[in-house]
Amino acid sequence: PEPPTACREKQYLINSQCCSLCQPGQKLVSDCTEFTETECLPCGESEFLDTWNRETHCHQHKYCDPNLGLRVQQKGTSETDTICTCEEGWHCTSEACESCVLHRSCSPGFGVKQIATGVSDTICEPCPVGFFSNVSSAFEKCHPWTSCETKDLVVQQAGTNKTDVVCGPQDRLRA
């Protein structure tokens, strides 16, 4: 067997000769011979090859199926595949982005730490002391409790991670 390094990186060995691979965006039609160079042809519409290759068929561009919540983020070329992303309010279920799921909402008592993107889900965090969230939302952060003091009011009901404090008037001492 021939040593694997007999030909250069963008070549392949066939019939005791180092033939050029086809460049990205092109497929192999015929191997080189002593009299001819490797014959390559450009990939057709909606096809691609992204490496120097000896493939006889180009790959089909990925289809971003709207029925799966997908849309085109970047159109494919003869050298690159189409990149799909998810419709607004949805995110990919995997790195390959073959389908989408609805963004998760953060329950009451939790706020949004990081808003979801086309490729990542919502990240929620528990509302710490002094903060609350009383809604289920994919956008709302934890809100700080109302400061009764700044309104010249007093706390009538303590806040929780799900409810704001309730402020009321200060008791007046009778004369």
């Epitope: 007999a6 030909c7 070549q11 005791s16 000769q17």
Partner: antibody, heavy 117, light 107 residues
Framework: EVQLVESGGGLVQPGGSLRLSCAAS????????MAWVRQAPGKGLEWVAT????????YYRDSVKGRFTISRDNAKNSLYLQMNSLRAEDTAVYYC???????????WGQGTMVTVS | DIQMTQSPSSLSASVGDRVTITCRAS??????LNWYQQKPGKAPKLLIY???NLEDGVPSRFSGSGSGTDYTLTISSLQPEDFATYYC?????????FGGGTKVEIK
């Protein structure tokens, strides 16, 4: 490491002959087409001839056709250029180089000087 | 035969300059173009093959572009070791033809 070493250059009278050799090492010589490229003193590069892997396909520049013969001996890892009917305009440094797609002239020898005077 | 017209034939530049050299073919050569660097008394060295591909070991400040008949070699930030003569060559068809060369000199 790929190495190409030319020899056989020298001073020759117009109408004379010379045979250049190129010893190849560091790669499988028989897998690669080879070529000669020359450079006249103070001038640019000029392709002279190319030979296919087993010698069945050969190309020459018009000005050397019928006077120069490129050949190879794969068993000896050697490339040759037989130069007859030499003219003053053939004076140049002659380089041996690999002519392999998609890189083409990827490795070169140090050159050998041919002076026709 | 395919004629290769290289310009400029010479240029003066300073270290750090961006340098552009062009090669024009007399007919479409479909990216079958290489660029070489040659220093005095030395053999040429391959820089770029098939118009845009950087040869192994060549610094990334060198780049090639173009298509059809017009091709460009760019040195993004000229270094002291880049002062040399640069040649293009077409490999589309025989006879293989070189451009006349561009000598890059220190300003």
């Amino acid at each position: 490491e790929v190495q190409l070493v030319e020899s056989g250059g020298g001073l020759v009278q117009p109408g004379g002959s010379l045979r250049l050799s190129c010893a190849a090492s560091g790669f499988t010589f028989s897998y690669f087409p080879m070529a000669w490229v020359r450079q006249a003193p103070g001038k640019g590069l000029e392709w002279v001839a190319t030979i296919s892997t087993s010698g069945g396909n050969i190309y020459y520049r018009d000005s050397v056709k019928g006077r120069f013969t490129i050949s190879r001996d794969n068993a000896k890892n050697s490339l040759y250029l037989q130069m007859n009917s030499l003219r003053a305009e053939d004076t140049a440094v002659y380089y041996c180089t690999r002519d392999t797609a998609p890189y083409y002239f990827d490795y070169w020898g140090q050159g050998t000087m041919v002076t026709v005077s | 035969d395919i004629q290769m017209t290289q310009s400029p034939s010479s240029l003066s530049a300073s270290v750090g300059d961006r340098v552009t050299i062009t090669c024009r073919a007399s007919q479409d050569i479909g990216n079958y173009l290489n660029w070489y660097q040659q220093k005095p008394g030395k053999a040429p060295k391959l820089l770029i093959y098939r118009a845009t591909n950087l040869e192994d070991g060549v610094p990334s400040r060198f780049s090639g572009s173009g298509s059809g008949t017009d091709y460009t070699l760019t040195i993004s930030s000229l270094q002291p070791e880049d002062f040399a003569t640069y040649y293009c060559v077409q490999h589309k068809q025989y006879p293989l033809t070189f451009g006349g060369g561009t000598k890059v000199e220190i300003k």
